[in-house]
Interface confidence: low
């Protein structure tokens, strides 16, 4: 039975040209996290593999940085980065947990950031 839950940064906004941290946290389960995939719609951004470490998709390597933790930092944001992002936790023995984050990249300099998220 899957007892875990994913906490995410939720809906966030950031300024064009700036950077943002996408963060998820899996709680309420003792399952082992074997891999975390970060995806944007149907594109794979990055993998954090317990065995093999971080790998950033080649098409994003100039604008995506691993961390902090299992999170992902997006840099040099453009309006085209607006959209849904997913953290997909592959765990054993539970299976797969998915968290959703909606990012809005604003032209304006008055982007309102969501509440700061911290990993417990």
């Amino acid at each position: 039975m899957m007892t875990g839950t994913i906490e995410t940064t939720g809906n966030i906004s950031a300024e064009k040209g700036g950077s943002i941290i996408l963060q998820c946290h899996l709680s309420s389960t003792t399952a082992q996290v074997t891999q975390v995939n970060w995806e944007q719609q149907d594109q794979l951004l990055a993998i954090c593999n317990a065995d093999l470490g971080w790998h950033i998709s080649p098409s994003f390597k100039d604008r995506v940085a691993p961390g902090p933790g299992l999170g992902l930092t997006l840099q040099s944001l453009t309006v085209n980065d607006t959209g849904e992002y997913f953290c997909i936790y592959h765990t054993y023995p539970d299976g797969t947990y998915t968290g959703r984050i909606f990012l809005e990249v604003l032209e304006s300099s008055v982007a309102e950031h969501g509440a700061r998220f911290q990993i417990p």
Epitope: Q32, T34, I47, N49, A50, D51, L52, H55, S57, Y92
Partner: antibody, heavy 116, light 110 residues
Framework: QVQLQESGPGLVKPSETLSLTCTVS????????MSWIRQPPGKGLEWIGI?????NTYYANWAKGRVTISKSSNQVSLKLSSVTAADTAVYYC????????????WGQGTLVTVSS | DIQMTQSPSSLSASVGDRVTITCQAS??????LAWYQQKPGKAPKLLIY???TLASGVPSRFSGSGSGTDFTLTISSLQPEDFATYYC????????????FGQGTKVEIK
């Protein structure tokens, strides 16, 4: 003594699934990376994929969607679906392959022919 | 993707010759490189790992050097049993990879 032995059918029909097993002895899969490699007749080595100590897998770009590597206590399995004549090759398993001390040792290899 | 390019693809040499094979990675792989020897009908045999460390039981006439993108396998004095095909292999990255091996270099008798 560390040993690897590939086994499986030597003949597979086109469009079917190729299934091979690598049986290991002398070391533990729980602390080892394991790779599958193939070599078409008269050609070079082609990497198929790797399975990590905790069961995580990475596959070659050309094999994604067709290949599955899994493991049990002392065996590593390779499944390659929808095979064609181009998949005819000698298939090897080897210990290591990712930031380790090279792939060593290798199994002796098993020839798989895809033909109707 | 990381591409591994070996050169030459083949070479002819005589017993006693010094032979050099090069391998170039399309991006920095630090020292995560291995070299293998393969004889016809046999499985590849590990010669060198971490770019320059000699594998157990490998004769000292084999040596490896390089880091980053450019690597070299040298056979200081070619012996009759060294006529074979040699492959380099990057161990740096296994995600989004087409092939970890170079295309091979066949060392033939002149």
């Amino acid at each position: 003594q560390v040993q690897l032995q590939e086994s499986g059918p030597g003949l597979v029909k086109p469009s079917e699934t190729l299934s091979l097993t690598c049986t290991v002895s002398g070391f533990s899969l729980s602390s080892s990376y394991m790779s599958w490699i193939r070599q078409p007749p008269g050609k070079g080595l082609e990497w198929i994929g790797i399975i990590g100590s905790n069961g995580n897998t990475y596959y070659a770009n050309w094999a994604k969607g067709r290949v599955t590597i899994s493991k049990s206590s002392n065996q590593v399995s390779l499944k390659l679906s929808s095979v064609t004549a181009a998949d005819t090759a000698v298939y090897y398993c080897a210990r290591g392959g990712y930031r380790t001390s090279g792939m060593d040792p290798w199994g002796q290899g098993t020839l798989v022919t895809v033909s109707s | 993707d990381i591409q591994m390019t070996q050169s030459p693809s083949s070479l002819s040499a005589s017993v006693g010759d010094r032979v050099t094979i090069t391998c170039q990675a399309s991006q920095n792989i630090y020292s995560d490189l291995a070299w293998y020897q393969q004889k016809p009908g046999k499985a590849p045999k590990l010669l060198i790992y971490r770019a320059s460390t000699l594998a157990s039981g490998v004769p000292s006439r084999f040596s490896g050097s390089g880091s980053g993108t450019d690597f070299t396998l040298t056979i200081s004095s070619l012996q009759p049993e060294d006529f074979a095909t040699y492959y380099c292999q990057q161990e740096h990255l296994v995600a989004w990879i087409y092939n970890v091996f170079g295309q091979g270099t066949k060392v033939e008798i002149k």
